[in-house]
């Protein structure tokens, strides 16, 4: 009798040791109990975000177990009947009604610890959890609106010239996307049946001194930033103004070449007549290097090869960003 002096875990409400398996405890409430006993009897509710796949511990009010009569946990999950887990101290019995989720349990024996634990939190655990403690001084409540958080998968890629796409896939709640520097952006949200949301932001930068852009994804589970270099995509549509220098340059070069050719034709006619039949071949040889150059580099030429190059660039950019 009284031989062992307890750490008040037996005498108080919970045992810290039992929280070793929990990666997030929903017991740490910034709000203090209200100031007098009559107000303490009023219900205290807390909205609590918790990451998916972690373990969570929910606490009752700070009532000494020695002074308890009944502890009841009421669990209301979306689309399910209300589940109750109760413990009666006088008879030392526990009772459950409509409780099917085996991951929601007492942390330990309820006569030692009134906490409730959720092992490996899933999206389906979104809901309202309430501890009701019946004591000689009345009923004390502590309720939690549990919001399960899902970290979105973030990707960033360039899909057109000076246009980038940032995606936050399957987050809960929806992530917020911002850009540095700001561009001309359009954001779309896609809602999934499991409660997650995909956010897609597409931005275009007209200003040419912008070479690197950063996509910043804000979420309750943490923030993430990815950056990308805006590479000029070969074969992509360009405005008419951008083509003018190329056109003028081409005309000038063609004019000069044509003029030289005419000079050659007129000034060397007698000389050419004395040559063999192979002259046109020589002429073609002289022109070949230039012809091949213009074909490979002039955007006015057929762009079939350029489209293939653009596709190659696209996959290259994707791969690089996934490794960030």
């Amino acid at each position: 009798e009284g031989a062992a002096q307890p750490n008040n875990s037996l005498m108080l409400q919970t045992s810290k040791e039992n929280h070793a398996l929990a990666s997030s405890s929903l017991c740490m409430d910034e709000k203090q109990i209200t100031q007098n006993y009559s107000k303490v009897l009023a219900e205290v509710n807390t909205s609590w975000p918790v990451k998916m796949a972690t373990n969570a511990v929910l606490c009752c009010p700070p009532i000494a177990l020695r002074n308890l009569i009944i502890i009841t946990w009421e669990i209301i999950l979306r689309g399910q009947p209300s589940c109750t887990k109760a413990y009666k101290k006088e008879t030392n019995e526990t009772k459950e009604t409509n409780c099917t989720d085996e991951r929601i349990t007492w942390v330990s024996r309820p006569d030692q610890n009134s906490d409730l634990q959720i092992r490996t939190v899933a999206i389906t655990h979104d809901g309202y959890y309430r501890c009701i403690m019946v004591t000689p001084d009345g009923n004390f409540h502590r309720g939690y609106h549990l919001q399960v958080l899902v970290t979105p998968e973030v990707t960033l890629f360039q899909n057109r010239n000076r246009t980038a796409v940032c995606k936050a896939v399957a987050g809960k709640p929806a992530a917020h996307i911002s850009w540095i520097p700001e561009g001309d952006c359009a954001t779309k949200q896609e809602y999934w049946s499991n409660g997650t949301v995909t956010v897609k932001s597409t931005c275009h930068w007209e200003v040419h001194n912008v070479s690197t852009v950063t996509c910043h994804v804000s979420h309750l589970t943490g923030n993430k930033s990815l950056y990308i270099e805006l590479l000029p995509v070969p074969g992509a549509k360009k405005s008419a103004k951008l083509y003018i220098p190329y056109i003028i340059l081409t005309i000038i070069i063609l004019t000069i070449v044509g003029f030289i050719w005419l000079l050659k034709v007129n000034g060397c006619r007698k000389y050419k007549l004395n040559k063999t039949e192979s002259t046109p071949v020589v002429e073609e040889d002289e022109m070949q290097p230039y012809a091949s150059y213009t074909e490979k580099n002039n955007p006015l030429y057929d762009t079939t090869n350029k489209v293939k190059a653009s596709e190659a660039l696209q996959s290259e950019v994707d791969t690089d960003l996934h490794t960030l």
């Epitope: 009284g2 008040n8 108080l12 405890s25 000494a64 002074n67 004390f140």
Partner: antibody
């Protein structure tokens, strides 16, 4: 209103015994844990013992363990402290106090009874 | 055992002026349920102790709002915003996290 009235104090010789009583009123005695706390003359407060509402658990300060016994009679709304092998250092005012439901302290105290251990 | 240390041990205060008492514990009083198991009691001359503050910062019923408690873990403070004559006495902090319950040595507040 809640009232706690201690009795049984007095002058006693070292090594002798004494039994203190605390009669409770104004609340459902059988629903609350009860404590004894003492205060030596001119000194601070020292917790002595606790008993649960149903008497199922009792805990003691090291200084009195094995010598003092806390008990209760819920039918009489009375708390007891049986003090054996008394020592001079047990001289103090002894208060009974009601265990507070919220947290882990004392919400109501008796007026105290003085125990003097002297030869 | 958890050791409670109060300072100052004596505090002369002019009526209407504020007063502040510090209490330090040898280990954290923050329970895993998020509450600090620290109480403040006042023992007026010739009387039994009375509860002022529970769970670190919650005023007990009937306690004037000039009394406030703050702190977490191992460091706690009791503040009296404007001292009144009836506030004189010895103030004790007490931890209820572990048995045995332990008190500070007490701070005697008196009129200057």
């Amino acid at each position: 209103q809640v009232q706690l009235v201690e009795s049984g104090g007095g002058v006693v010789q070292p090594g002798r015994s004494l039994r203190l009583s605390c009669v409770a009123s104004g609340f459902t005695f059988s629903s609350y844990g009860m404590h004894w706390v003492r205060q030596a003359p001119g000194k601070g407060l020292e917790w002595v013992a606790i008993i649960w509402n149903d008497g199922s658990n009792r805990y003691y300060a090291d200084s009195v363990k094995g010598r003092f016994t806390i008990s209760r009679d819920n039918s009489k709304n009375t708390l007891y402290l049986q003090m054996n092998s008394l020592r001079a250092e047990d001289t103090a005012v002894y208060y009974c106090a009601r265990d507070r439901i919220v947290g882990a302290g004392f919400d109501y105290w008796g007026q105290g009874t003085l125990v003097t251990v002297s030869s | 055992d958890i050791v409670m240390t109060q300072s100052p041990l004596s505090l002369p205060v002019t009526p209407g002026e504020p007063a502040s008492i510090s209490c330090r514990s040898s280990q954290s009083l923050l329970h895993s349920n998020g509450y600090n198991y620290l109480d403040w009691y006042l023992q007026k001359p010739g009387q039994s102790p009375q509860l002022l503050i529970y769970l670190g910062s919650n005023r007990a019923s009937g306690v004037p709002d000039r009394f406030s408690g703050s702190g977490s873990g191992t460091d706690f403070t009791l503040k009296i915003s404007r001292l009144e004559a009836e506030d004189v006495g010895v103030y004790y902090c007490m931890q209820g996290l572990q048995t045995p319950w332990t008190f500070g040595q007490g701070t005697k507040v008196e009129i200057k």
